[in-house]
């Protein structure tokens, strides 16, 4: 959680003079209560905006709004205390808007807006805006709290903000996987303009289980200028066992932005489908010999194996 | 002292509900996030349920959702899971878990023991 | 949901011996990684959060690196004390897994 370096966030607008501070999120008024306290905010809403910083880079932010009720304790609001919690890791940071003038109401509903904290793609925050100054124990809680989740880097406006690219959003592979036969899956996938290498994780699954019973890593190596933006295609071989039918096809890149940390893209093929009634068995002989070498009581051990090609 | 004291374990039929409580002591309990963390007898560590400070979000293991329901009362400093439809997989130390700031859970409870069985 | 291993399930070490335990997470989650040691009968202590940071009151002897899919708990000098299961937890997004855990003792 960190809060957006350009330009200086403002507070102030016409008929309030106000400024912005960093806060330690434990305002004066907790330790030292007030008899008179204002009413909690109205309205408050979190979006998704966007946001430059000095060096050009774009970055997610939460755009902070929300209104003042139309009551006398208006006159007793000093500014307020914007929070923003991230959820898994407990971490806070806030600021203040300092009043350096009092309120008084007027023709339209006052108004106010945020957007200088930085978010992370995929991440859940709670944020808290809080009228100063708070509320003495067991008086009504003056604050109103939203919880706001950052879509990840496939949405389509994150996929162009700098922590997203960083981690290989602009690369779609475009992965097509088709099976040639019970052993051998054949894997499309187009490649980055990058001089990087690319693994391709295979797991294969029972027809309706979650626990894999085949798994299989296959390295590609970077390929030559080029080759950018060609087509790649890998062939691998399957583990021969009966209804280990659906697979999994993970292509890792390893671009320099973000190492083993890039976004992973997959695909998978289904196991084909049952009749709902069994076959009935023939009373006649079939008129063609079953092909040689097509047993399905093959070698347990028999290890996956692959072999890659890049298309011009 | 930073203290998480769980309580409420037992031992139940299959089919059974059981409320567990956690008391947290010695820090600003309506601040924290929590988790509910399960041991099975000589298993690993399985995440069960976590819920935010204002009990805004929550979160279930897909091992126990729909039967569990995790909740809080920060008036109490106190946690709560309440475990419905108990099955015999459910029998584990149970341990209530503050996650620090920045990552992790840095302060767990003594952990108490649900034992299901008929 | 992410899938958390970890190798090896158990390693035997003498004392002094450096000791790395590995710690794989089936997708990337940046370095939204812990790492926990649990002695027999007790609960499990936070060693390092964050992938690499050290909980304070953690022996420096313990180190945490890595990012996005590969992750290593190293022990520099393993000491006695340090006979323990070790466990590393993804807390990026819920589920918030735990790896299988490794089981270390002295030979």
């Known amino acids: 959680l960190r809060l957006l370096d350009f330009p200086a966030p403002v507070c102030a607008q016409e008929g309030l003079s106000c400024r912005v501070k960093n806060s330690t999120c434990l305002d004066d008024s907790w330790i030292h209560p007030r008899n008179l306290t204002p009413s909690s905010p109205k309205d408050l809403q979190i979006q998704l905006h966007f946001a430059h910083t000095q060096q050009g880079d774009l970055f997610p932010v939460a755009h902070i709004e929300w209104t003042l009720q139309t009551d006398a304790s208006i006159l007793y609001l000093e500014g307020a205390e914007l929070s923003v919690l991230q959820l898994n890791t407990n971490e806070r940071l806030c600021v203040r808007f300092e009043f350096l003038s009092k309120l008084r109401h007027h023709h339209r509903r006052w108004r106010f807006t945020f957007s200088h904290f930085v978010v992370d793609p995929d991440q859940e925050y709670e944020v808290t805006v809080h009228h100063l100054p708070k509320p003495i124990p067991d008086g009504d809680p003056n604050h109103q709290s939203k919880n706001f989740l950052v879509p990840d880097c496939e949405h389509a406006r994150m996929k162009v903000t700098t922590p997203c690219m960083s981690s290989g959003s602009l690369w779609d592979p475009n992965i097509t996987v088709e099976t040639l036969d019970t052993q051998h899956l054949r894997v499309d996938f187009t490649l980055w303009n990058e001089s990087t290498h690319y693994q391709i994780l295979l797991t294969s699954f029972p027809h309706m289980e979650n626990h894999s019973c085949f798994e299989h890593m296959h390295h590609i190596p970077a390929p030559r200028p080029e080759e950018f933006h060609q087509r790649s295609n890998v062939t691998l071989t399957l583990r021969n066992l009966k209804g280990c039918c659906r697979h999994q096809v993970q292509i890792q890149p390893f671009f320099s932005s973000c190492l083993n940390d890039c976004l992973r893209h997959s695909a998978t093929v289904s196991c084909p489908e049952m009749p709902d009634t069994p076959e009935p068995i023939p009373d006649y002989m079939p008129l063609w010999e079953p092909r040689s070498g097509s047993s399905d009581y093959k070698d347990d051990d028999d290890k996956g194996s692959s072999h890659h090609h890049h298309h011009h | 002292e930073v203290q998480l004291v769980e309580s409420g374990g037992g031992l139940v039929q299959p089919g059974g509900s059981l409320r567990l409580s956690c008391a947290a002591s010695?820090?600003?309990?309506?601040?924290?996030?929590m988790n509910w963390v399960r041991q099975a007898p000589g298993k690993g560590l399985e995440w069960v349920s976590f819920?935010?400070?204002?009990?805004?979000?929550?979160y279930y293991a897909d091992s126990v959702k729909g039967r569990f329901t995790i909740s809080r009362d920060n008036a109490k400093n106190s946690l709560y899971l309440q475990m419905n439809s108990l099955r015999d997989e459910d029998t584990a130390v149970y341990y209530c878990a503050r996650p620090k700031v920045g990552g992790g859970m840095d302060v767990w409870g003594q952990g108490t023991t649900v034992t299901v069985s008929s | 949901d992410i899938q958390m291993t970890q190798s090896p399930s158990s390693l035997s070490a003498s004392v002094g011996d450096r000791v790395t335990i590995t710690c794989r997470a089936s997708?990337?989650?940046?370095?939204?990684l812990a790492w926990y040691q649990q002695k027999p009968g007790k609960f499990p202590e936070l060693l390092i959060y964050a992938a690499s940071t050290l909980q304070s009151g953690v022996p420096s002897r313990f180190s945490g690196s890595g990012s996005g899919t590969d992750f290593t708990l190293t022990i520099s000098s393993l000491q006695p004390e340090d006979v323990a299961t070790y466990y590393c937890q993804k807390y990026n997004r819920a589920p918030f897994t735990f790896g299988p855990g490794t089981k270390v003792d002295i030979k």
């Open positions: 997708q990337g989650i940046s370095n939204y």
């Open positions: 819920i935010s400070a204002r009990s805004s979000t929550i």
């Open positions: 010695g820090f600003t309990f309506s601040s924290y996030s």
